[in-house]
């Protein structure tokens, strides 16, 4: 009896694992083995596919074959018993195009209100992704074990920290990788769970902001308690992307070591131009807080994205705000030749309830105010360019009283 060729051959590639699956054409024929050949582009001859010769099952692994993953290959399969079937040719394919990204490895560390996530590719030193190792981004799904309500976080790098969590609470998460340059989305890692620690005695510093004054950066933060010392560390933001980088190391800013105020000043020129992360930690001599949330700090943007200056014209039921160019030292206006959007925050002086207006124009009306009431206003600028996506610090608050009724004209 003539053997039939196997049918429906599927090629599955996950990272550097190359798996072939196929269907037997004739289940009634026993003791059949299967063999594959492959052919590279531009070659006439077929070569035996090692790892896939005389296979008794309907699956084989040819990961050991050192292929150029960007080069198209063709496969063929036949069944063998006493005689052989005709060859069945599989559509040619390029391994890289066909490959899926496998589940990443995930390692978690718990703080009281944060989880540190270390992510690395599932296959170490992968041949498939050798040229793309630094292009991986990750996304994750996280949920409280008790509730199951999921939150998705997109576009993170290999070291990520999730803040604003509850102490002594179990959180679960799963992570998948993506290569956006190649339109590839990977498969999720197994679920990892971790319990946050007991609430720390000292909270981390909050509301960290960087501003520029007279060729210096001024770093300010808020803290709950007095009589503390603080330290500030920096890291080049690029290192967040690179999991295997042995140079990944947070370092101190000398001017900001053991400072006793909630600010420190360091010269603009100590950093080479680029994007950095900064973090602050508090200590009372006995206890130390966890590190603050990391803030991104771009020397190129920070150096020229200053808070706006503005004048207020007060009416009975509104403020007219006129925004001008910020001033450098020496009172000269800064020319900012890129589009800005302004965020204006205002509040009644006797209340904490803030309201917000976002405006592209430099003349803004703040409506629906009460007559003879003191309102305070602060503003900051944001770049409208998505690539830059930078913000100035807020200006100092300016407080003005609205006029008596019937002066809105």
């Amino acid at each position: 009896k003539n053997l039939k060729s196997p049918q429906k051959v599927e090629v599955d590639i996950i990272d550097d694992n190359f798996i072939l699956r196929w269907n037997r054409s004739d289940e009634s024929v026993g003791n059949v083995t299967f063999s594959f050949d492959y052919q590279k582009t531009g070659m006439d001859n077929w070569i035996k596919l090692s790892g896939c010769q005389n296979i008794t099952s309907t699956k084989c692994n040819f990961s050991s074959l050192k292929l150029n993953v960007y080069e198209e290959i063709k496969l063929r399969i036949r069944a063998e018993k006493e005689n052989t079937s005709s060859w069945y040719e599989v559509d040619s394919f390029t391994p890289f195009r066909k490959a899926q990204i496998g589940p990443p490895e995930v390692h978690l560390e718990a703080e009281d209100k944060a989880i540190v996530i270390h992510i690395s590719p599932g296959t170490k030193d992968s041949v498939m992704w050798a040229l793309d190792g630094l292009s991986f981004t990750y996304s994750l799904v996280i949920w409280k074990n008790s509730s199951g309500v999921e939150e998705r976080i997109e576009n993170i790098y290999s070291r990520h920290k999730i803040y604003k969590l509850s102490p002594e609470t179990t959180y679960c998460l799963k992570v998948k990788a993506a290569l956006l340059t190649s339109w590839k989305i990977g498969v999720y890692s197994p679920v990892h769970c971790i319990k946050t620690t007991v609430e720390n005695e000292l909270p981390p510093p909050e509301n960290i902001e960087v501003s520029v004054q007279n060729q210096n950066y001024v770093l300010k933060w808020d803290y709950t308690y007095a009589n503390m010392t603080f330290q500030v560390q920096w890291l080049h933001a690029f290192l967040k992307r690179n999991p295997g980088n042995h140079l990944y190391k947070w370092k101190q800013i000398p001017d900001c070591e053991n400072v006793k105020t909630t600010q420190c000043v360091f010269p603009q020129n100590v950093f080479q131009k680029g994007i950095y992360l900064l973090r602050v930690q508090a200590s009372d001599g006995n206890n130390t807080s966890f590190w603050s949330e990391e803030i991104k700090f771009d020397t190129e943007i920070q150096a020229f994205l200053l808070p706006p200056v503005f004048n207020i014209r007060s009416l009975s039921d509104s403020f007219h705000i006129y925004i001008g160019a910020p001033k450098q030292s020496g009172n000269t206006p800064v020319i900012q030749d890129y589009p800005l959007i302004y965020e204006i925050i205002f509040w009644e002086n006797t209340s904490n309830a803030e309201r917000k207006i976002i405006e592209k124009k430099t003349d803004v009306t703040v409506p629906n105010l009460k007559p003879l009431t003191v309102y305070c206003v602060k503003a900051r600028a944001h770049t409208m360019d998505e690539k830059l996506n930078k913000s100035s610090v807020f200006s100092d608050a300016v407080c003005e009283k609205t006029k008596p009724g019937n002066t809105s004209k």
């Epitope: 980088n245 140079l247 001017d255 080479q272 950095y276």
Partner: antibody, heavy 117, light 107 residues
Framework: EVQLQESGPGLAKPSQTLSLTCSVT????????WNWIRKFPGNKLEYMGY???????YYNPSLKSRISITRDTSKNQYYLQLNSVTNEDTATYYC???????????WGQGTTLTVSS | DIQMTQSPASLSASVGETVTITCRAS??????LAWYQQKQGKSPQLLVY???TLEDGVPSRFSGSGSGTQYSLKINSLQPEDFGSYYC?????????FGSGTKLEIK
């Protein structure tokens, strides 16, 4: 392991243009900062400039009119060009890596340039 | 530019001794100071940055200290491999500048 290796002509005549190459292995020059530093015969060290991961450059103002630093990311190399060399440019030229502040944790072995007519 | 003055220009010491090299800046450099060791025919090696932080892999017999304009590098219990030249360098402003070096020789 990060390794840097300088290469260059060794000898140049006054007024010529000096071209040096720094080949980096074990690390991508699309991370961090890649500097040139030279050491004169009397052991004085001078900082020359850098090219960054993004291609941003900084030159020591004392050299600004004569210096150019470029890179080829596909070869993982960066380059120093110094125009109109004189005897005063006789030195050992080093390439070095920095991580964001101006101190240098990996250096090449150095290449010696002698300027002489 | 900030000038860095290093002293002594050279010193002789024996294995097991403790030596101190000093560096004075022409202005306050706020601890933005690095120390390097260079052996004959080799490239400089970073020992200390931020005036007192030891670079990974550097033996603990090396220590940096100082503040303002005055800084020092101390080597306890000198080893044969410690002989060579030492340079300080500030990175408080640009361009960064180096000291003129101290040559440490075996007595």
């Amino acid at each position: 392991e990060v390794q840097l290796q300088e290469s260059g002509p060794g000898l140049a005549k006054p007024s010529q243009t000096l071209s040096l190459t720094c080949s980096v292995t074990g690390y991508s020059i699309t991370s961090d900062y890649w500097n040139w530093i030279r050491k004169f015969p009397g052991n004085k060290l001078e900082y020359m400039g850098y090219i960054s991961y993004s291609g941003t450059i900084y030159y020591n103002p004392s050299l600004k009119s004569r210096i150019s630093i470029t890179r080829d990311t596909s070869k993982n190399q960066y380059y120093l060009q110094l125009n109109s060399v004189t005897n005063e440019d006789t030195a050992t030229y080093y390439c070095a890596r920095s991580g964001g502040m101006y101190y240098f944790d990996y250096w090449g072995q150095g290449t010696t340039l002698t300027v002489s007519s | 530019d900030i000038q860095m003055t290093q002293s002594p220009a050279s010193l002789s010491a024996s294995v097991g001794e403790t030596v101190t090299i000093t560096c004075r800046a022409s202005g306050n450099i706020h601890n933005y100071l690095a120390w390097y060791q260079q052996k004959q025919g080799k490239s400089p090696q970073l020992l200390v940055y931020n005036a007192k932080t030891l670079e990974d892999g550097v033996p603990s017999r090396f220590s940096g200290s100082g503040s303002g304009t005055q800084y020092s590098l101390k080597i306890n219990s000198l080893q044969p491999e410690d002989f060579g030249s030492y340079y300080c360098q500030h990175f408080w402003s640009i361009p960064p500048t180096f000291g003129s070096g101290t040559k440490l020789e075996i007595k």
